[in-house]
């Protein structure tokens, strides 16, 4: 056989040395170069010439080393599906989209295709923090001891109870998971019908 270092070269077992940057071309029974990201095959390889690549036209891309004869068309992020753009399309990368604030990915096919509104977390709970924003719906967890959250909201966080003594006040009513501590001026008694958190 003829030992050759660069494509096109003969392949008896139908595999190529560099699987990422080369591919097996079955008609000629050889290994040929793939085209780099941002390009496509403008002329196929043969035993006498390697693949000829050309740059993707504007508004098209190829992300990987490939032997595609066309570039993929750039697609905008669809706001109707709840998506927004985080990075524009380039010849080497498709448009990068994510779910709009307050939404999560409800349909995933290699990438997010449809976002839905995050569920509200009821008072006394907050959304569990996730590694990646928009990846899944809210999972509401109770506020930890000494914290409260008093709204129905997809994004409100549990806050620490007010420490009355830090403000020179005294506790009138203890805080709960759904309400803050009620403080009062140490010199005045708090009328029972008053529900404000602080009385000065």
């Amino acid at each position: 056989s003829q030992p050759q270092a660069v494509p096109p070269y003969a392949s008896e077992n139908q595999t190529c040395r560099d699987q990422e940057k080369e591919y097996y071309e079955p008609q000629h029974r050889i290994c040929c170069s793939r085209c780099p990201p941002g390009t496509y095959v403008s002329a196929k390889c043969s035993r006498i010439r390697d693949t000829v690549c050309a740059t993707c036209a504007e508004n098209s891309y190829n992300e990987h080393w490939n032997y595609l004869t066309i570039c993929q068309l750039c697609r905008p992020c669809d706001p109707v599906m709840g998506l927004e753009e985080i990075a524009p399309c380039t010849s080497k990368r498709k448009t990068q989209c994510r779910c709009q604030p307050g939404m999560f990915c409800a349909a995933w096919a290699l990438e997010c295709t449809h976002c839905e509104l995050l569920s509200d977390c009821p008072p006394g709970t907050e959304a569990e923090l996730k590694d990646e924003v928009g990846k899944g719906n809210n999972h509401c967890v109770p506020c930890k001891a000494g914290h409260f959250q008093n709204t129905s909201s997809p994004s409100a966080r549990c806050q620490p109870h007010t420490r009355c003594e830090n403000q020179g006040l005294v506790e009138a009513a203890p805080g709960t998971a759904q309400s803050d501590t009620t403080c009062k001026n140490p010199l005045e008694p708090l009328p029972p019908e008053m529900s404000g958190t602080m009385l000065m």
């Epitope: 003829q2 079955p26 008609q27 000629h28 043969s46 006498i48 010439r49």
Partner: antibody, heavy 120, light 107 residues
Framework: EVQLVESGGGLVKPGGSLKLSCAAS????????MYWFRQTPEKRLEWVAT????????YYPDSVKGRFTISRDNAKNNLYLQMSSLKSEDTAMYYC?????????????WGQGTTVTVSS | DIKMTQSPSSMYASLGERVTITCKAG??????LSWYQQKPWKSPKILIY???RLADGVPSRFSGSGSGQDYSLTISSLESDDTATYYC?????????FGGGTKLEIK
């Protein structure tokens, strides 16, 4: 001893169909790419079709693409060429040919040929 | 398609004579050229592959040379058994294409 024996040739009217067969013996048929070549009455040699060792890939020149279909049965050691929409220019001797399976890609064995005549 | 121009189309030569047939490719075919001998009423038979390599069982009086676009088949000392038509074939790029053939006869 490698043997390739073609059959199925004959006289057919323009627009008609014909199926050629090639019985292979003396080698491991499923290890080789197989071809059909033809030789016109003017003695010009032409490539007609290629099929890969496992039968997954088939290739044709533009002159027969869409009209001819190459296939193989590795269990029976048989190669086939289904020809349809035949034209007078398809008149030729058809050869079943083996491509060597090393790195030089030459055609090491040819059958004796079968004659196809397309005429009204 | 790569055009293969073979010459001469026919020739007469004497026994013992040195005979050369040439083939010119329309572009560089990087030695992916083989030579075939066809006797009357027989199928083609491989003589030379990869431009210069002698196929198994072929007499050593046959040899091939050339590179790039230009190739030749030489019979060093013609024998009566060499009466035949000789074809070159490029298999560097599909579609594979043959030369028009050279009909060799004894004077």
């Amino acid at each position: 001893e490698v043997q390739l024996v073609e059959s199925g040739g004959g006289l057919v009217k323009p627009g008609g169909s014909l199926k050629l067969s090639c019985a292979a013996s003396g080698f491991t048929f499923s290890d080789y790419y197989m071809y059909w070549f033809r030789q016109t009455p003017e003695k010009r040699l032409e490539w007609v079709a290629t099929i890969s060792d496992g039968g997954s890939y088939t290739y044709y020149p533009d002159s027969v693409k869409g009209r001819f279909t190459i296939s193989r049965d590795n269990a029976k050691n048989n190669l086939y060429l289904q020809m349809s929409s035949l034209k007078s220019e398809d008149t030729a001797m058809y050869y079943c040919v083996r491509e060597e399976n090393g790195n030089f890609y030459y055609f090491d064995y040819w059958g004796q040929g079968t004659t196809v005549t397309v005429s009204s | 398609d790569i055009k293969m121009t073979q010459s001469p189309s026919s020739m007469y030569a004497s026994l013992g004579e040195r005979v050369t047939i040439t083939c010119k490719a329309g572009q560089d075919i990087k030695s992916y050229l083989s030579w075939y001998q066809q006797k009357p009423w027989k199928s083609p038979k491989i003589l030379i592959y990869y431009a210069t390599r002698l196929a198994d069982g072929v007499p050593s009086r046959f040899s091939g040379s050339g590179s790039g676009q230009d190739y030749s088949l030489t019979i060093s000392s013609l024998e009566s058994d060499d009466t035949a038509t000789y074809y070159c074939l490029q298999h560097g790029e599909s579609p594979w294409t043959f030369g028009g053939g050279t009909k060799l006869e004894i004077k």
